[in-house]
């Protein structure tokens, strides 16, 4: 089937487009929703910075780059893209800077090429364990997504549902095994204290996972043998005391990973020595000259590189009767 | 790494058809939109026309009447056939992709075959 | 037709030297243009994508600017294996077109 041969770029300037769940209506070949910009040689459509309060309905079918940034879209409903003939062709979908708070069950359904998803830098308050997996089934259908851009969706603490945020993002990650062809997971800047431990190990397609800027103090619990495609793993500014041996063991078996550690409070005392030996010997670790202590206050700011076992020590714990009040 | 490599034949007579076949080894065939594009001696680029995964084609206007470009997937490759060629046709030919992954917003062609050097002459 | 007009048409300069090379369109192309190297006997090779992207593997001495009608490739200090041709292309509107090319020699 042939495509016209030539598309004009369209910038429309009417007022915003109300969506319906379901547009019954194909799109007619040429058309741009109002306030986007529409590119048919490029498979995009822009609509950013316009304050849509909804998807538009009258996407183009070629659509294979949608761009909905900078919006008030506030809610994505179930069915927010689904169209009939649907949209094919729709491969990336970027929603950040939106101001979503919830995205229900089923938000991303109909959408069978979509590759790539980006909610970052959006308060979601209310994110469905089903929303990337479109039902509640034990096994649901597999997502086609490949990468998840997830950085900085952490609402603000007043506007917290009262319940756990770690729990309520890995949920929606794990619910119905939809996600086992994913490669990119970015969770950056969420405020996370700790990870849930079955996470990682449901993700085995796992190539890239980003979780720089949280509030992570440890990994004990977190098991990373699965991830045998992992390459990379970001866990800069973090909250970071020591990583263990057996997280240690596990990285280093782990045959194409680079792991990041910069900024974290590393604590070099006794429990610091197979770590700092490990450091010594590894390659797996990108910019390891950089890392150095925060704690105790006597080791601020030393190299772990250079640090021997002579260097780490822990305080001797008292026995009961000598300690002071 | 998506490789190109293209052959076709190198000397035509004025009228004759021009056919090039490229064949693409080492990445995803869907993910691409795959091109061709021409250059004449000492000259610059023009762009003849591109093909998608699911065969919607496009062509430059300039020489729709005269084009047709076709995949085979079975075969990971993609063709160009040009009829009626005269010497403004002698070029070098290269097939060229866009679109680096699938999910990715990538707007370049990234991935180039060698270049077939075509000369029309009588 | 889009069309895209580079300029200058040769641009003389010296290794270490900083090179500025404009294209401008007949109409907006938005962010959809790319930039190519091309050397003799080569096919060429994408430098920059989506207006300020570099692609993979490019120096970080190569930088695109610019949205709309007008663009900028700068190299900001010219390696011996710089000196090339250098041709804008958009994506915006069918057909796709590039510009007349930049060679950049050596003074």
């Known amino acids: 089937s042939s495509s016209p041969t030539s598309s004009a770029s369209s910038f429309s300037s009417s007022a915003p487009f109300l969506a319906s769940a379901v547009s019954a209506q194909p799109p007619l070949p040429d058309q741009c929703p109002a306030l986007c910009e529409c590119s048919e040689a490029a498979r995009t459509v822009k609509c950013v910075n316009r304050n849509l309060t909804e998807v538009p309905t009258d996407l183009p079918a070629y659509v294979r780059n949608l761009f909905l940034t900078g919006n008030q879209l506030a809610v994505l409903p179930a069915g927010a893209f689904a169209r009939r003939p649907p949209l094919a062709e729709l491969a990336a979908l970027n929603l950040s800077g939106s101001r979503l708070d919830e995205v229900r069950a089923g938000a991303f359904e109909h959408l069978p090429s979509l590759r790539q998803l980006d909610l970052s830098h959006n308060p979601l308050a209310d994110l469905s364990p089903f929303a990337f997996s479109g039902s509640n089934a034990s096994v649901s259908a597999p997502s086609p997504l490949v990468e998840l851009i997830l950085n900085h969706i952490v609402p603000p603490e007043d506007e917290r549902q009262n319940r756990s945020f770690e729990g309520m993002v890995v949920a929606a990650l794990l619910a119905g095994r939809a996600l086992q062809g994913l490669r990119r997971l970015e969770l950056a800047s969420n405020h996370f204290l700790y990870l849930p431990r079955d996470v990682l190990a449901q993700l085995p397609s796992l190539r890239h996972l980003d979780l720089s800027n949280n509030s992570l103090v440890s990994l004990t619990y977190v098991s990373f043998r699965n991830l045998t495609h992992l390459e990379s793993l970001h866990l800069e500014d973090n909250a970071l005391k020591v990583l263990h041996n057996g997280t240690l063991a596990e990285l280093q078996g782990l045959p194409h990973i680079r792991v990041f550690l910069d900024n974290n409070p590393w604590v070099c005392d006794c429990h610091m020595a197979d770590m700092v030996t490990w450091l010594k010997e590894t390659e797996v670790v990108q910019g390891k000259d950089r890392l150095t202590c925060a704690y105790p206050e006597k080791m601020r700011n030393r190299v772990l590189l250079e640090l021997n076992s002579a260097d780490l020590d822990c305080d001797p714990i008292l026995p009961p009767s000598l300690q002071t009040s | 790494q998506v490789q190109l490599q293209q052959w076709g034949a190198g000397l035509l007579k004025p009228s004759e058809t021009l056919s090039l076949t490229c064949a693409v080894y080492g990445g995803s065939f869907s993910g691409y939109y795959w091109t061709w594009i021409r250059q004449p001696p000492g000259k610059g680029l023009e762009w003849i026309g591109e093909?998608?995964?699911?065969?919607?084609?496009n062509y430059n206007p300039s020489l729709k009447s005269r084009v047709t470009i076709s995949v085979d997937t079975s075969k990971n490759q993609f063709s160009l056939k040009l009829s009626s060629v005269t010497a403004a046709d002698t070029a070098v030919y290269y097939c060229?992709?866009?679109?680096?992954?699938?999910?990715?917003?990538?707007?370049?062609?990234?991935?180039w075959g060698q270049g077939t050097t075509v000369t029309v002459s009588s | 037709e889009i069309v895209l007009t580079q300029s200058p048409a040769t641009l003389s300069l010296s290794p270490g030297e900083r090179a500025t090379l404009s294209c401008r369109a007949s109409q907006s192309v938005s962010s959809y243009l790319a930039w190519y190297q091309q050397k003799p006997g080569q096919a060429p090779r994408l430098l920059i994508y989506?207006?300020?992207n570099r692609a993979t593997g490019i120096p970080a001495r190569f930088s695109g600017s610019g949205s709309g009608t007008d663009f900028t490739l700068t190299i900001s200090s010219l390696e011996p294996e710089d000196f090339a041709v250098y041709y804008c292309q958009q994506r915006s509107n069918w057909p796709l077109t590039f510009g007349g090319g930049t060679k950049v020699e050596i003074k």
């Open positions: 989506d207006a300020s």
């Open positions: 093909i998608d995964h699911s065969e919607s084609t």
């Open positions: 060229a992709g866009w679109f680096g992954e699938l999910y990715h917003y990538y707007y370049g062609m990234d991935v």
